[in-house]
């Protein structure tokens, strides 16, 4: 079974900078999985943001600002990255990655 690890416990950025969050997949080939990213703002329900499927297809939640989030995967390091552009107050949250095995 696949296992996920988010090595960064926290990431501190100044306004308008870029944050990159990592999710390391083990126990399964990342190319054979879909990785989903979610965020949980304080006091709010968890929200789906973006996913990258086994074939590389990216799906973004409607209503998420255009260009705010970018998802990628690096098979060599078995890692999925979530890039948050122009960090703002509204981006303060806990971000989770999740796995769906094909």
């Amino acid at each position: 079974a696949g296992h996920l690890e988010q090595p960064q416990i926290s990431s501190t950025k100044t306004l308008s900078k870029t944050a990159r969050l990592e999710c390391v997949v083990s126990g399964i080939t990342i190319s054979a999985t879909s990785v989903y990213w979610y965020r949980e703002r304080p006091g709010e329900v968890i929200q789906f943001l973006v996913s990258i499927s086994y074939d590389g297809t990216v799906r973004k939640e409607s209503g998420i600002p255009s260009g705010k989030f970018e998802v990628d995967r690096i098979p060599e390091t078995s890692t999925s990255t979530l890039t948050i552009h122009n960090v703002e107050k509204q981006d303060i949250a806990t971000y989770y990655c999740a796995l769906w095995e094909v």
């Epitope: 306004l15 304080p42 107050k89 509204q90 303060i92």
Partner: antibody, heavy 125, light 109 residues
Framework: EVQLVESGGGLVKPGGSLRLSCAAS????????MNWVRQAPGKGLEWVSS????????YYADSVKGRFTISRDNAKNSLYLQMNSLRAEDTAVYYC??????????????????WGQGTTVTVSS | EIVLTQSPGTLSLSPGERATLSCRAS???????LAWYQQKPGQAPRLLIY???SRATGIPDRFSGSGSGTDFTLTISRLEPEDFAVYYC??????????FGQGTKVEIK
């Protein structure tokens, strides 16, 4: 002293348009979320719209959604409110207001700490 | 949408008296997201309290805020002549709308 100065108000006929401006001085606008708040004659405060520091997150009150557009030009240290399809009920004093910002890991609200003096919009035939 | 209801609508008091203003939310509001403002005739509002209980810069210590959940209170311990004004509570979160209460007018008795 940090300051916000609104302009662009005036008398307009129903269905008309106006563009309000808000100029910031002695602080860097790009570091703050900004808001428009209005107050109809003899009434209370009504939040109208907000825009995040990098313009990614934009919100409107239901009463103005689809008619008003908030924007900002951080290079010019200015905030704008484009108002279209104006109605009599849009008559109010319009204030721009600065959201004091955030720090740390908590989404913490510090209030609207700097307000402009207001600009009056009157919609009447 | 969270609705904030302020009471009383008008508070008639004399200088030196204690004023207690109430703000009740239709659903629970994080105390981190509750602010109070003062507005005098012909002037823009002024931030008094943020985070339900923290005084904004330059606000005298006779103003204090308290409460959590759905019930919040602004207290003015001893009214000064310049405190007679309209007071608004406001809730704010990471999603809109960022509503204000309808206001409480503190007038001279």
């Amino acid at each position: 002293e940090v300051q916000l100065v609104e302009s662009g108000g005036g008398l307009v006929k129903p269905g008309g348009s106006l563009r309000l401006s808000c100029a910031a001085s002695r602080f860097t606008l790009s570091s703050y979320d900004m808001n428009w708040v209005r107050q109809a004659p003899g009434k209370g405060l009504e939040w109208v719209s907000s825009i995040s520091s990098s313009s990614s997150y934009i919100y409107y009150a239901d009463s103005v959604k689809g008619r008003f557009t908030i924007s900002r030009d951080n290079a010019k240290n200015s905030l704008y409110l484009q108002m279209n399809s104006l109605r009599a009920e849009d008559t109010a004093v319009y204030y721009c207001a600065r959201d004091r910002g955030v720090g740390g890991t908590d989404y913490y609200y510090y209030g609207l700490d700097v307000w402009g003096q207001g600009t009056t919009v009157t919609v009447s035939s | 949408e969270i609705v904030l209801t302020q009471s009383p609508g008008t508070l008639s008091l004399s200088p030196g008296e204690r004023a207690t203003l109430s703000c009740r939310a239709s659903q629970s509001v994080s105390s981190s997201y509750l602010a109070w403002y003062q507005q005098k005739p012909g002037q823009a509002p002024r931030l008094l309290i943020y985070g339900a209980s923290s005084r904004a810069t330059g606000i005298p210590d006779r103003f204090s805020g308290s409460g959590s959940g759905t019930d919040f209170t602004l207290t003015i311990s001893r009214l000064e002549p310049e405190d007679f004004a309209v007071y608004y509570c406001q809730q704010y979160g990471s999603s809109p709308p960022y509503t204000f209460g309808q206001g409480t007018k503190v007038e001279i008795k």
